[in-house]
């Protein structure tokens, strides 16, 4: 068990803070909830603290919760491939470019680390080149979320990882908006981290609303499990 993994044996409170600017539309979001890495479970509620969110909530899911991939459930035989927990408590910087097909792009940069007993994800997001009447600024996405696989590989040169995946957002007219994600994670501290063999995270997300919440918000339930590395031969013959 890595030193960082020991911090995730129970339920951990999570705080998320985002400052965003998309095509000049500035906004802030605060989120809170908890994560339980034993089950790969996240429960979070996000509120736009600046009024109405200028982009659809589903376009921010990867920035919020795929930001705290340290809550992914890594099966026993894959624990030596869990970069995310091994970087804790000092944490990691997570950077992404997200290309929305036939539309603009987001760049995000986040610091994910422990502050006391709370896992904090502090994010900046800059969006450019979006069409004012497109699927994103035109709010044409359905309020739901598909399952995805998130592919992880080691970046030995930077003592971190690179991550690629393609999100499929459902559009109200029945079509799909693709969002290509290119991610890199770099440890904040200088201590040793686990550099993984290639594998993937399998994610399932459910979006809902709080009937008692008047502000623009999103409630998120997510399950994430690591997969893609088989048991060693010694395991097979036990």
């Amino acid at each position: 068990m890595s030193k960082g993994e020991e911090l995730f044996t129970g339920v951990v409170p999570i705080l998320v803070e985002l400052d965003g600017d998309v095509n000049g539309h500035k906004f802030s979001v605060s989120g809170e909830g908890e994560g339980d890495a034993t089950y790969g479970k996240l429960t979070l509620k996000f509120i736009c603290t600046t009024g109405k969110l200028p982009v659809p909530w589903p376009t921010l899911v990867t920035t919020f919760s795929y930001g705290v991939q340290c809550f992914s459930r890594y099966p026993d035989h894959m624990k030596q491939h869990d970069f995310f927990k091994s970087a804790m408590p000092e944490g990691y910087v997570q950077e992404r470019t997200i290309f929305f097909k036939d539309d603009g792009n987001y760049k995000t940069r986040a610091e994910v680390k422990f502050e006391g007993d709370t896992l904090v994800n502090r994010i900046e997001l800059k969006g450019i080149d979006f069409k004012e009447d497109g699927n994103i600024l035109g709010h044409k996405l359905e309020y739901n979320y598909n399952s995805h696989n998130v592919y992880i590989m080691a970046d030995k040169q930077k003592n971190g990882i690179k991550v690629n995946f393609k999100i499929r957002h459902n559009i109200e007219d029945g079509s799909v908006q693709l969002a290509d994600h290119y991610q890199q994670n770099t440890p904040i501290g200088d201590g040793p981290v686990l550099l993984p063999d290639n594998h993937y995270l399998s994610t399932q997300s459910a979006l809902s609303k709080d009937p008692n919440e008047k502000r623009d918000h999103m409630v998120l339930l997510e399950f994430v499990t690591a997969a893609g590395i088989t048991h060693g031969m010694d395991e097979l013959y036990k």
Partner: nanobody, 115 residues
Framework: DVQLQESGGGLVQPGGSLRLSCAAS????????MGWHRQAPGKQRELVAS???????NYADSVLGRLTISRDNSKNTVYLQMNSLKPEDTAVYYC?????????WGQGTQVTVSS
């Protein structure tokens, strides 16, 4: 309230060394690209060295091999180690912090290389 506080400047002889520090407060330091710029009297401000949030470094041709930029995220501080200093390195050195959304500057620290 955001502050970038430079220190470590001074008078040094040619061939000597200095270590500049820039302590940041009021920002999420680790997600900022940090840079050292300098401005000599009567000249434009120029980028000397930079280090990204992902710890990639970049240097002006004129300082390659003599200056080294580094960062300590646990101390919210960026450093500039200056070796083999030359009279033409004389300038006010400014610390810059730039993120996706924000851009901040320090007040500067004077470096004078003279015999």
């Amino acid at each position: 309230d955001v502050q970038l506080q430079e220190s470590g400047g001074g008078l040094v002889q040619p061939g000597g060394s200095l270590r500049l520090s820039c302590a940041a407060s009021g920002i999420v330091f680790s997600i900022y690209d940090m840079g050292w710029h300098r401005q000599a009297p009567g000249k434009q401000r120029e980028l000397v060295a930079s280090i990204t949030s992902g710890k990639n470094t970049n240097y002006a041709d004129s300082v390659l091999g003599r200056l080294t930029i580094s960062r300590d995220n646990s101390k919210n501080t960026v450093y500039l180690q200056m070796n083999s200093l030359k009279p033409e390195d004389t300038a006010v050195y400014y610390c810059n912090a730039r993120s996706l959304l924000y851009d901040y500057w320090g007040q500067g620290t004077q470096v004078t290389v003279s015999s």
